[in-house]
Amino acid sequence: KSSNEATNITPKHNMKAFLDELKAENIKKFLYNFTQIPHLAGTEQNFQLAKQIQSQWKEFGLDSVELAHYDVLLSYPNKTHPNYISIINEDGNEIFNTSLFEPPPPGYENVSDIVPPFSAFSPQGMPEGDLVYVNYARTEDFFKLERDMKINCSGKIVIARYGKVFRGNKVKNAQLAGAKGVILYSDPADYFAPGVKSYPDGWNLPGGGVQRGNILNLNGAGDPLTPGYPANEYAYRRGIAEAVGLPSIPVHPIGYYDAQKLLEKMGGSAPPDSSWRGSLKVPYNVGPGFTGNFSTQKVKMHIHSTNEVTRIYNVIGTLRGAVEPDRYVILGGHRDSWVFGGIDPQSGAAVVHEIVRSFGTLKKEGWRPRRTILFASWDAEEFGLLGSTEWAEENSRLLQERGVAYINADSSIEGNYTLRVDCTPLMYSLVHNLTKELKSPDEGFEGKSLYESWTKKSPSPEFSGMPRISKLGSGNDFEVFFQRLGIASGRARYTKNWETNKFSGYPLYHSVYETYELVEKFYDPMFKYHLTVAQVRGGMVFELANSIVLPFDCRDYAVVLRKYADKIYSISMKHPQEMKTYSVSFDSLFSAVKNFTEIASKFSERLQDFDKSNPIVLRMMNDQLMFLERAFIDPLGLPDRPFYRHVIYAPSSHNKYAGESFPGIYDALFDIESKVDPSKAWGEVKRQIYVAAFTVQAAAETLSEVA
């Protein structure tokens, strides 16, 4: 295989040898080992796991394995002063209180240090007032409430169901609406699949189960006290009042048993339509306040959590490249969990562990990759992607010059139906070619390729005979590498057949019931889906690190740029009068995309024909491929989001989990009809078209012949 030529290794040490070394039984064993106690960021238990992983990666054969520590802002409940929500009567007596903890799952009753459900980084406070039900607390839900229903959330406590969008966006929206507190709950409509039992008898969420999670709006900043710079020993830290992304109102999560008690008394307006109704036996009235008999009762929140600067530890392993040691392919996933981390993150960490073991086995037999592979076990992902972001901030100069690709490795499964891939268009062909070579683990696809089962179960909406590959959003550790630094990135996992519930997660997400047994009994008893994900993630890393010519196809970027330009033009044309009045032209953008397409096509022709035995020319062509993603970075960043610098992709301003294309133009156009100064608003649209067109043209020119 050509990918072996430059490293002078025996033919058996190819991709097949690497893949054959991966074993489902090992992944299972590692998952068990990583999930027996909680590994909350900033705790001694998670530090001990970091040291264990360091030791084992060294044993597996990596050249070096180091801990990289940072002192970052984390958030914990007060151990002696628990958080809860009450219904109070007119005398102020608490007539109902929400539960203080989740009932522990069987076998875990005596485990200590299970953090009770809380919303990380909630400020302290004891607000009381009338309740307003705000559906998913999305931008459009508040538009419906405020504009159509004329319901004012100012001074109210809002209750929102989890799902559809990142919880931090819900809190931000509630704050902007003037709410003084937020209650988040899991509705069975979103977290209880019909026909499946609750844990421990199935994979559904029981009524006492609660989703933990941070509620920050960091927009890529990392540690809230040291935006842009590593939280090291000599860091200058902002005061808490100047910290990035902290919520300003108390927030607390509850399960659906407790939610029932709050929602069943709701009065006021009826839900506007059926999309506001969940599956509880309650009216889903919007409020404000309780119905007739209970109208004098109020809701009171009791939040006493504290923000604390705490030490976190990343584990960074290095397998030095034989030919291009100054080119880095990174495989990273987090280690910290909310409780046991049965799926998130340890189903991913176990896969990384097995990938490291396989690479180490090959290295012990005399093999080395062409390029350096870095392996990372990130800390404090659950608290805002802190470990990965601080490390990238500390190493940004190296990464921007040497970073070839980043492959993310959080949860390996969120279901067991089919593959799900989000990545840069540069990796489309790599993913297609790799999955054609891997066996499908799916029932009914014995002897068929992963590509075939994936394409059948998750077809591309645009191209027949191809699988769906999604845009990268955020909410995971690739964010700093892709959105800030412009390093080609991708992620892969097994997912559910639940397209309408795309961003709600699996039912037991971030609950105490996310255990080893959940995975072993209900999701993947044979660990065959984990093995497939290991093959995809590991195979991508292998090819990226070992192929002589980088496995990036710039023509696929041209195709999507055209699609995204068409889409944003169509959105803008929904305002034809303003387009005409303010002379808004997309000509420059379409021209730039046309030029990109032509230059990418010519580059691809040269890539087929050049002399691969000439190391200087080879390096030159590879550098053009490596730096293409970097060329989409605007050093000034997006408006009000300086750490989101990619002009083609950014996390949606309305849902951190989702990716938006041409985000600068999209945000400038969003709700433009409501802007008080239309001339200024359309001026910003024109500016964003200019920035996008310039960036696409500039990126195209990086692919031109160098002289």
Epitope: K563, D566, K567, Y569, S570, F586, F590
Partner: nanobody, 113 residues
Framework: EVQLLESGGGLVQPGGSLRLSCAAS????????LSWVRQAPGKGLEWVSS????????DYADAVKGRFTISRDNSKNTLYLQMNSLRVEDTAVYYC??????WGQGTLVTVSS
């Protein structure tokens, strides 16, 4: 010089059909998304539909969804709008638009019994 020339308008009864065409010249036709926009008598401009480089990427205003079909023939540098089940409220001058600033002269569609 960019030129967009619409044709195919006329008088039609409610429930009838028309097919509008827009012949384009002076630019690389296949490189641009295109739109139809209309203006009813005494009203402002209203977006109708847009199409990307091929017939797979299309978008419609709610008022016309299911009745109108936008398409293009890149080999003929022509944009089309097939209008079925026409209603009185579809009466308007229909414009072909490239990139937001280049507009045709328009073709009048009158739906009346």
């Amino acid at each position: 010089e960019v030129q967009l020339l619409e044709s195919g308008g006329g008088l039609v009864q409610p429930g009838g059909s028309l097919r509008l065409s827009c012949a384009a010249s002076g630019f690389s036709f296949s490189s641009y998304a295109l739109s139809w926009v209309r203006q009813a008598p005494g009203k402002g401009l209203e977006w109708v539909s847009s199409i990307g480089e091929n017939n797979a990427t299309t978008d419609y205003a709610d008022a016309v969804k299911g009745r109108f079909t936008i398409s293009r023939d890149n080999s003929k540098n022509t944009l089309y709008l097939q209008m079925n089940s026409l209603r009185v409220e579809d009466t308007a001058v229909y414009y072909c638009v490239k990139d937001g600033v280049h507009w045709g002269q328009g073709t009048l569609v009158t739906v009346s019994s």
